[in-house]
Amino acid sequence: MMTGTIETTGNISAEKGGSIILQCHLSSTTAQVTQVNWEQQDQLLAICNADLGWHISPSFKDRVAPGPGLGLTLQSLTVNDTGEYFCIYHTYPDGTYTGRIFLEVLESSVAEHGARFQIP
C-alpha cells in the first residue's frame, strides 16, 4: 500500500530572465527512492538516479542545474517555460509518486497589481 505523500514548493510566479528552484519532498513512507525524474509536459528535463547520479537532458543543459538535493534549478527563465512541472519519484517497494508544480513566467514589464516575485 502506498502511504507516502509528496510535498512541493507550491506554484511559482517569476520574472523572465530570473531563476527558480523546483523542489519536492517525499514523506510518510519508508520506501527507498531509486530515481527521481523531472518532466514538463511530456518532456524529460532531468533524472537523479540513486546509483548513477544526475543526468540533464541535452536540450536543457544550458539552463537547468541539478539540486539542491533532489530539486532542480531553472535559470534564464523565458515566457515559454510557463507550464506544469512534475517530480516523479520511483520507489521500492511502493511504486511511483508524482508531485506537480505550476510555473508562470512573466515579462518584467507586465507584472500587474504589484505582484511580488522572489528570484534567488
Partner: antibody, heavy 119, light 112 residues
C-alpha cells in the same frame, strides 16, 4: 474592455461528446492563462484545468483527466473545452475564466455554458 | 489534493451588519518563496462568479473597500464591513498554491 463570450446552452444525450467555446476580446489572448471551472446543480465550484495560449501547455485537475480536453485557437483568440462521453453527472454550468497574472486566481469570467445530459 | 473548508455554510445577516467568513486549508498555502495564493469570489444567482480579493488581501479593481481579506498559512478571513443588498450571494475562497486549484465549499450570505 475584457470580455469572454461563451457558446450557448446544450442539451445532449448520454455517451456523446461536445465542445464548448470561449471567445476572448479586449486583451492580449496569449498573455494570460485560460481556466475552466464547473458548477454542478446546487454544488460547489470545481476547477477543471487551464491552458497557456502562448505555448499550448495545459494543467488538469486529475478528476477531469479523460473527461475534459482544453485547446486554443490563437488566430481567433478562442479557448475550447471538449467534454467526452457525457453522463448525467456532467450536467452543469461550465465557465471559462482568465488567469490573473502573478497570483493564480481568475479575474474575468465568461457568462457560463449550461450543459444538460439527458436521454 | 488540498482540502479547503469554509465556515459558516450559511450566514443570515441584516443590512448594515459586519460579517466574517473563514477559509481553512489542509496544508499551508505559502509557497517556498513566501507567496500565498488565496483568492475570494462572490457568485450571485444568475451571474458569473466575480473576483473580490486576490493574494490574501488585495482588492480587485472596482471592489468596494468594505471588503477586506486577511490571514496566513492555513487560516484566512474575508470581512465585509457594512452589508449592502448587492453583497448577497455565495462566497467562495480558492487556493491556487497547489495543483489542482481547489475551492472552498461556499458560504451563503442571505437576509435574516
Amino acid at each position: 474592455e475584457v470580455q469572454l463570450q461563451q457558446s450557448g446552452p446544450e442539451l445532449v444525450k448520454p455517451g456523446v461528446s461536445m465542445k464548448i467555446s470561449c471567445k476572448a476580446s479586449g486583451y492580449s489572448f496569449t498573455g494570460y492563462t485560460m481556466n475552466w471551472v464547473r458548477q454542478s446543480h446546487g454544488k460547489d465550484l470545481e476547477w477543471i484545468g487551464l491552458i497557456i495560449p502562448y505555448n499550448g501547455g495545459t494543467s488538469y485537475n486529475q478528476k477531469f483527466k479523460g473527461k475534459a480536453t482544453i485547446t486554443v485557437d490563437k488566430a481567433s483568440s478562442t479557448a475550447y473545452m471538449d467534454l467526452l462521453s457525457l453522463t448525467s453527472e456532467d450536467s452543469a454550468v461550465y465557465y471559462c475564466a482568465r488567469g490573473l497574472r502573478g497570483y493564480f486566481a481568475m479575474d474575468y469570467w465568461g457568462q457560463g455554458t449550461s450543459v444538460t445530459v439527458s436521454s | 489534493d488540498v482540502v479547503v473548508t469554509q465556515t459558516p455554510l450559511s450566514l443570515p445577516v441584516s443590512f448594515g451588519d459586519q460579517v466574517s467568513i473563514s477559509c481553512r486549508s489542509s496544508q499551508s498555502l505559502t509557497n517556498s518563496y513566501g507567496n500565498t495564493y488565496l483568492s475570494w469570489y462572490l457568485h450571485k444567482p444568475g451571474q458569473s462568479p466575480q473576483l473580490l480579493i486576490y493574494g490574501i488581501s488585495n482588492r480587485f479593481s472596482g471592489v468596494p473597500d468594505r471588503f477586506s481579506g486577511s490571514g496566513s498559512g492555513t487560516d484566512f478571513t474575508l470581512k465585509i464591513s457594512t452589508i449592502k443588498p448587492e453583497d448577497l450571494g455565495m462566497y467562495y475562497c480558492l487556493q491556487g498554491t497547489h495543483q489542482p486549484w481547489t475551492f472552498g465549499g461556499g458560504t451563503k450570505l442571505e437576509i435574516k
